[in-house]
């Protein structure tokens, strides 16, 4: 019996506006029909969470108003977006997954993806 | 700094119920599942429950599944575990324990000893 | 349910030796194993985590290895504060399960 695994891509490029989209999918031990997503963030062995959606199988995800992400699910596999990121956010971004019902209850964490964040350069002033 | 501090365990008769509660302070609550585990006199460490996040996914080992009730306050950042028709075989210390954002129990409280015993 | 087992139960070490514990699970587990370190009258203290890394603030001798079902916990050189016991703990799938303890005292 192999254990849950979770696939994310290792390196991502955020946009020039500040937009950083990757999928994370897993593999499941058995037939679950409410998964939550997390996102953490690690930086100098520091993990945070950025944000974080339970979603019932078949139905979309939903983070809160206030969060940073958005996302879409279709079966085993998250689209994930994360919006308003600068250079300074730049480190590894971790999706873990949660098996949370039926039980038994069950972990799978990915390697992480490594987004970078590049501030664009301020337009120059032009005179006409 | 992360603290969590248990309470309310006791001298208890056989058949009868108990409270414990865990206060927890220094960190987003809500975002951590809370476990109970405990250990009997001279013996390992045994998990009791898990209580996920909002309070609605819990999960109970099956030695006191239909006896014990795991639950939280989110507003007020506490932990609770309702003993009910206690054994002698509960006789232990227990313990809460937060998990990590990742895996593994990062802190856990210092301990409440519950005794059964007629 | 996973089952965990340890070996050896116990063990007695000279201060400066290297001591390795090791402790199996019943079913893959991937890398979701922990190690904790208890001293007697106090709660246990979280060591490693996911079978390999470093929890915060503890001392770098000791290292995690392992995944899928066999794991190790090595103390490279042991110290005075190093005796105590030393538990397992899969975080994988309910209900969550420790291993029976090994017991490090001093030879």
């Known amino acids: 019996c192999k254990a849950m695994h979770v696939a994310q891509p290792a390196v991502v490029l955020a946009s020039s506006r500040g937009i950083a989209s990757f999928v994370c999918e897993y593999a499941s031990p058995g037939k679950a029909t409410e998964v939550r997503v997390t996102v953490l963030r690690q930086a100098d062995s520091q993990v945070t969470e950025v944000c974080a959606a339970t979603y019932m199988m078949g139905n979309e995800l939903t983070f809160l108003d206030d969060s940073i992400c958005t996302g879409t699910s279709s079966g085993n596999q998250v689209n994930l977006t994360i919006q308003g990121l600068r250079a300074m956010d730049t480190g590894l971004y971790i999706c873990k997954v949660e098996l949370m019902y039926p039980p038994p209850y069950y972990l799978g964490i990915g390697n992480g993806t490594q987004i970078y964040v590049i501030d664009p350069e301020p337009c120059p002033d032009s005179d006409f | 700094q992360v603290q969590l501090v248990e309470s309310g365990g006791g001298v208890v008769q056989p058949g009868r119920s108990l409270r414990l509660s865990c206060a927890a302070s220094?960190?987003?609550?809500?975002?951590?599942?809370m476990h109970w585990v405990r250990q009997a006199p001279g013996k390992g460490l045994e998990w009791v429950a898990v209580i996920w996040y909002d309070g609605i996914n819990k999960y109970y080992a099956d030695s006191v599944r239909g006896r014990f009730t795991i639950s939280r306050d989110n507003s007020n950042n506490t932990l609770y575990l309702q003993l009910n028709s206690l054994r002698a075989e509960d006789t232990a210390v227990y313990y809460c324990a937060r998990n990590s954002l990742l895996t593994g129990w990062d802190y856990w409280g210092q301990g409440t000893l519950v005794t059964v015993s007629s | 349910d996973i089952q965990m087992t340890q070996s050896p139960s116990s063990l007695s070490a000279s201060v400066g030796d290297r001591v390795t514990i090791t402790c199996r699970a019943s079913?893959?587990?991937?890398?979701?194993l922990n190690w904790y370190q208890q001293k007697p009258g106090k709660a246990p203290k979280l060591l490693i985590y996911a079978a390999s890394s470093l929890q915060s603030g503890v001392p770098s001798r000791f290292s995690g290895s392992g995944s899928g079902t066999d794991f190790t916990l090595t103390i490279s050189s042991l110290q005075p504060e190093d005796f105590a016991t030393y538990y397992c703990q899969q975080s994988y799938s309910t209900p969550f399960t420790f291993g029976p303890g090994t017991k490090v005292d001093i030879k």
């Open positions: 220094g960190f987003t609550f809500s975002s951590h599942g």
């Open positions: 079913q893959s587990i991937s890398s979701y």
